[in-house]
């Protein structure tokens, strides 16, 4: 184009509907020029202006001839230009905040603009910059691009930001520009301008505060604290640790937390310090919920529902930021919320739910929440499976007789529609418990009770119960303890009886054990003692407990003596015993040794014998008649140890073995024994009952029982020269081996000539008894041989 | 157990100056920071001043702001509030008080001493 | 300066009645900060509560605290004869560290 005409021809376009062209009118031309301005493939395509821009309808594609004269006093002059979309910018109007707001307490901007769509013929995206700048010197915080799409018609946008410093720190401004990426349009897009911008800021009033406030944040975010001051902050300490400062505008600081460790329970103070003054805020830094743990529901009582868990990892949260708890039941939709005051007990936390009518199966879902997050777990129960019983109350004994009593026990809830395992443990004193389970149906009104049988009477038993459902999920803890004593019945048995003559023959004494008290069944008050012959039955008086013997004056012809126990229920059948014993003249008496606390006594099996076997023993050294105490076996039995209290090491005892039939007992064998054989207490006393030049003759004594303490098993003679008060050595003193010893077994010896002696010269003598339970001391003398003649 | 025991009161004239002792046992001194607080006749508890745990901070209430100064000897278990150009307006009850928190700034005061008396007056 | 002032000035009540004492700030506080103490006559004051609704060691569970921003509130659920006092609230989140002016809880 030439310098004169018309040039440098540009068109724009806000809206892809109308073309703003311009251009710039030829050097030397005034105000007075007319512009004609006509489009080739247009009707009506020339228009006359005064102005150089012309709004055209947007042309469609292709390549268009645009001529423009340009009429002026001195003349006219043509320019030539080929138009195409290609050559035109869609350059968007320049955006309008509508409205800027901020959620101090959230640190959030909201942002609210129109986007004008109606103007546009199709859809299109829209490319959105928002920047937001901080303090009065505009500092770029953030610069981020936001997409919508244009759908013919006008539409507000909100945009919200979070920002990384409390608003009240410093002011904010915000603008946005555009940028429409439409596919219908081939020319050039560009941004359009920026919007006027907006600002928020807090009114401080003269006080100087610190931001934020109490604020609950993620172990391990950053965090930015500030001071709003008007005079010099000096420093800012986050716990003890100083923090640079960020200058903001006035005297206004602000210092930034990298990472933040997890708070103490009372927070972590942040500290501003003046010259004069300090300033705090508190930051509570913990941890979103876990997710519930162990959650786990039970029912004592078939009425509540007891939801226990664990809340898994701490949260450091504490107070009125502590995790909150919901329980929710999805088949009712009904709720429960946990109270914060409801401390945790031992690390678990719980909640009670009431139980619906007719509802057996419940889905909950334990919600957590605090202002970190929340999370939740789900169980799903059937509660009649799941029935942890009260502990039972009110545990009562009665009894219905001697050998049965009655249970009683409160356990509260309604469980008529299940049944219950209950577990009875008995324990006899001194014995071990034994537990018994019962089957028992559940009821409404909480009462139950049982009957137990197969008992002792007059017995003192502890009883204690505890329950679970028949399903069985956990045992209830145990009832109280309940001592009782069943009532006595008749005793069982006739005393466990023995006779023996007196040891003029005059009497028979009777001799009765007390009977153990799973026998007597009751305290035994006194005794019946009748006996009786072919002819004639005589009883003796009532026998008081708590004495065990009686004599009656017999002939020697054969009685059948009998005794009866009474309690206060009635009497024992009786214990039979035949005055005489059946003779047995094939006697031998045996030797028996035990094992230190009894003695084995052993027989061969006799099927004469059928009531049962008698052993009798007494201290050998006693007077008649000789009882010391017996004990009675079963005729099947053919050995018994004999233990007692009473048996001492070294004491002789006789032992005699009686076999019964048809109430007569006769003697089978007789023995003498020791429980432990010792060695004898006293030596022999000897004398020397005749000298020679080469021999001596020496003859001793029996040793008594008592002092024998064993069974004599022989004796030891020693001898050898020597002298009485000289300096020469003993004859048991070691070393010497011209002393002879002589072991005398054979028990009758009572005489010894020693042969091949010396004459005229002193010996010594000693002599010792031996048991198998040692050697007994020694007895000496000194003898002089008589001269060879 | 913890206690707290102030000294140094009594009667003294306008513009003079005294000096206050709290003696502390029973804790570890050196970690917490310390508090005077007053309280007239018949009036309310008034906070008068507070050193930090290791002595390096002191704030005071603007009344005694440039005449009172709180200092501590840790070694000696010792807090002071020096007190000079002494007013009427300075008739009080004056206790030490110990923060709460072991090591921390901004508490409240958990323990406080029995107080000790001081009239100001001509 | 936080300013804080107490409502109301005097309570009169009988033991076993239940006490409602409050607070309030100049401006927002941190309940992070603000305590309660109990004075009796001729005794130091006793920390009762202590970050708007902490309980301090040894208080018996019928004083609690509660409030946030301005307003806070000291209640004392069953009065018993040793409660009867002067009962004060304080700021310590900002020097000068301020008390209320007390109110008096008396047997009526």
């Known amino acids: 184009q030439k310098k004169g005409a018309p040039h440098d021809l540009k068109c724009v376009t806000n809206n892809l509907q109308v073309w703003d062209c311009y251009w710039k009118a030829p050097s030397g031309t005034g105000r007075g020029t007319d512009y004609e301005v006509c489009i080739e493939n247009r009707s009506h395509s020339c228009y006359q202006l005064e102005k150089t821009n012309i709004k055209i309808p947007a042309l469609s594609h292709g390549d268009y001839e645009i001529t423009i004269n340009s009429l002026h006093d001195f003349g006219s002059s043509t320019s030539k230009f080929t138009l195409n979309e290609q050559n035109v910018s869609l350059i968007p109007d320049t955006p309008e905040i509508l409205n800027l707001s901020a959620d101090f307490s959230t640190s959030t901007l909201y942002l609210k603009w129109n986007d004008r769509g109606s103007v546009f013929p199709h859809h299109s995206n829209v490319i959105w910059e928002i920047k937001i700048l901080r303090k009065e010197s505009m500092e770029l915080v953030k610069l981020v691009t936001h997409n919508t799409t244009l759908n013919g018609k006008d539409t507000l946008h909100h945009w919200s930001w979070a920002s990384d410093m409390p608003l009240e720190c410093a002011i904010h401004f915000v603008e946005i520009r555009c940028y429409i990426d439409s596919l219908h349009f081939s020319g050039r897009k560009e941004w359009s301008d920026w919007s006027p911008v907006k600002n928020i800021s807090w009114m401080p009033d003269s006080q100087t505060k610190v931001f934020p406030q109490d604020k609950v944040i993620l172990v391990g975010s950053d965090i930015t604290f500030c001071c709003i001051s008007q005079e010099k902050v000096l420093s800012a300490l986050i716990g003890h640790t100083n923090c640079p400062l960020i200058h903001l505008d006035g005297e206004n600081v602000a210092i930034k937390i990298h990472n933040i460790s997890v708070s103490a329970s009372s927070g972590t103070n942040v500290v501003f310090t003046t010259e004069d003054n300090i300033f705090g805020t508190v930051i509570f830094a913990g941890y979103p919920p876990d997710t519930p743990q162990q959650l786990n529901c039970e029912t004592h009582d078939l009425k509540e529902i007891l939801c226990r868990w664990n809340p898994g990892r701490a949260t450091a949260l504490v107070g009125p930021r502590a995790t909150s708890y919901t329980l929710l039941e999805s088949f009712s939709g009904k709720y429960v919320r946990f109270k914060r005051a409801e401390a945790p007990t031992n690390g678990s936390y719980q909640l009670f739910f009431q139980m619906l009518p007719n509802q057996e199966i419940y889905n909950f879902t334990l919600n957590a929440h605090n202002p970190l997050g929340r999370s939740e777990s789900t169980i799903l129960v059937n509660i009649t499976e799941k029935v942890y019983p009260h502990t039972p109350t009110s545990f009562k004994v009665k009894d219905i007789n001697s050998t049965a009593v009655k249970l009683s026990w409160h356990l509260p809830g309604n469980f008529a529609k299940i049944n219950f395992l209950c577990q009875i443990e008995i324990k006899k004193s001194n014995t071990v418990q034994e537990q018994r389970n019962v089957t028992i149906k559940g009821v409404e009104n909480s009462s139950y009770l049982v009957a137990l049988d197969k008992l002792n009477p007059y017995t003192v038993y502890t009883f204690r119960i505890r329950c679970s459902t028949e399903t069985f999920w956990k045992w209830s803890k145990w009832s109280n303890k309940k001592q009782h004593l069943t009532t006595e019945a008749i005793p069982s048995k006739g005393p466990d009886t023995w006779r023996e003559w007196s040891s003029d023959g005059k009497n028979l004494i009777i001799y009765w054990k007390p009977l153990p008290i799973n026998e007597a069944n009751g305290k035994i008050l006194s005794y019946n003692v009748s006996c009786s012959s072919d002819e004639e039955t005589q009883s003796l008086s009532e026998i008081p407990d708590p004495q065990h013997k009686a004599e009656i004056q017999l002939d020697k012809n054969d009685y059948i003596i009998s005794v009866v126990a009474k309690n206060s229920v009635g009497s024992s059948p009786p214990s039979k015993i035949a005055s005489m014993e059946i003779p047995n003249d094939d006697l031998k008496i045996e030797q028996v040794v035990g094992m230190g606390k009894g003695i084995l006594l052993t027989w061969h099996y006799d099927p004469n014998m059928t009531c049962d076997y008698v052993i009798k023993w007494c201290n050998s050294s006693r007077s008649e008649p000789c009882l010391m105490d017996w004990r009675k076996v079963p005729s099947n039995s053919t050995e018994t140890v004999i233990e007692s209290d009473q048996f001492r090491p070294g004491v002789r005892y006789n032992f005699f073995l009686y076999g019964c039939r048809n109430q007569g007992y006769q003697l089978l064998r007789s023995m003498i024994g020791y429980i432990e054989e010792l060695a004898p207490t006293v030596a022999p006393n000897f004398t020397v009952e005749d000298t020679s030049a080469d021999s001596i003759l020496v003859k001793w004594e029996d040793i008594p029982v008592e002092e024998l303490r064993g069974f004599l098993r022989g004796y030891l003679f020693y001898f050898g020269k020597g002298e009485r008060d000289t300096s020469k050595m003993r004859v048991l003193e070691s070393g010497r081996s011209d002393i002879k010893v002589k072991n005398i077994t054979d028990i009758s010896q009572k005489t010894l000539r020693i042969a091949d002696l010396q004459g005229k010269t002193s010996y010594h003598l000693v002599l010792r008894a031996y048991t198998d339970g040692g050697v007994g001391p020694e007895k000496s003398m000194y003898v002089v041989t008589k001269e060879n003649s | 157990q913890v206690q707290l025991v102030e000294s140094g009161g009594g009667v003294v004239q306008p513009g003079r100056s005294l000096r206050l002792s709290c003696a502390a046992s029973g804790f570890t001194f050196s970690s917490y920071g310390m508090d005077w607080v007053r309280q007239a006749p018949g009036k309310g508890l008034e906070w008068v001043a507070v050193?930090?745990?290791?002595?390096?901070?002191?704030y005071y209430a603007d009344s005694v702001k440039g005449r009172f100064t709180i200092s501590r000897d840790n070694s000696k278990n010792t807090l002071y509030l020096q007190m000079n150009s002494l007013r009427a307006e300075d008739t009080a009850v004056y206790y030490c008080?110990?923060?709460?928190?072991?090591?921390?700034?901004?508490?409240?005061?958990?323990?406080w001493g029995q107080g000790t008396l001081v009239t100001v007056s001509s | 300066k936080i300013v804080l002032t107490q409502s109301p000035g005097t309570l009169s009540l009988s033991p076993g009645g239940r006490a409602t004492l409050s607070c309030r700030a100049s401006q927002s506080i941190s309940s992070s900060y603000l305590a309660w103490y109990q004075q009796k006559p001729g005794q130091a004051p006793r920390l009762l509560i202590y970050a708007a609704s902490n309980r301090a060691t040894g208080i018996p569970d019928r004083f609690s605290g509660s409030g946030s921003g301005t307003d806070f509130t000291l209640t004392i659920s069953r009065l018993e004869p040793e409660d009867f006092a002067v009962y004060y609230c304080q700021q310590y989140g900002s020097s000068p560290f301020t008390f209320g002016p007390g109110i008096k809880v008396d047997i009526k």
């Open positions: 050193i930090w745990y290791d002595g390096s901070n002191k």
């Open positions: 008080a110990r923060e709460l928190w072991f090591g921390e700034l901004l508490s409240p005061f958990d323990f």
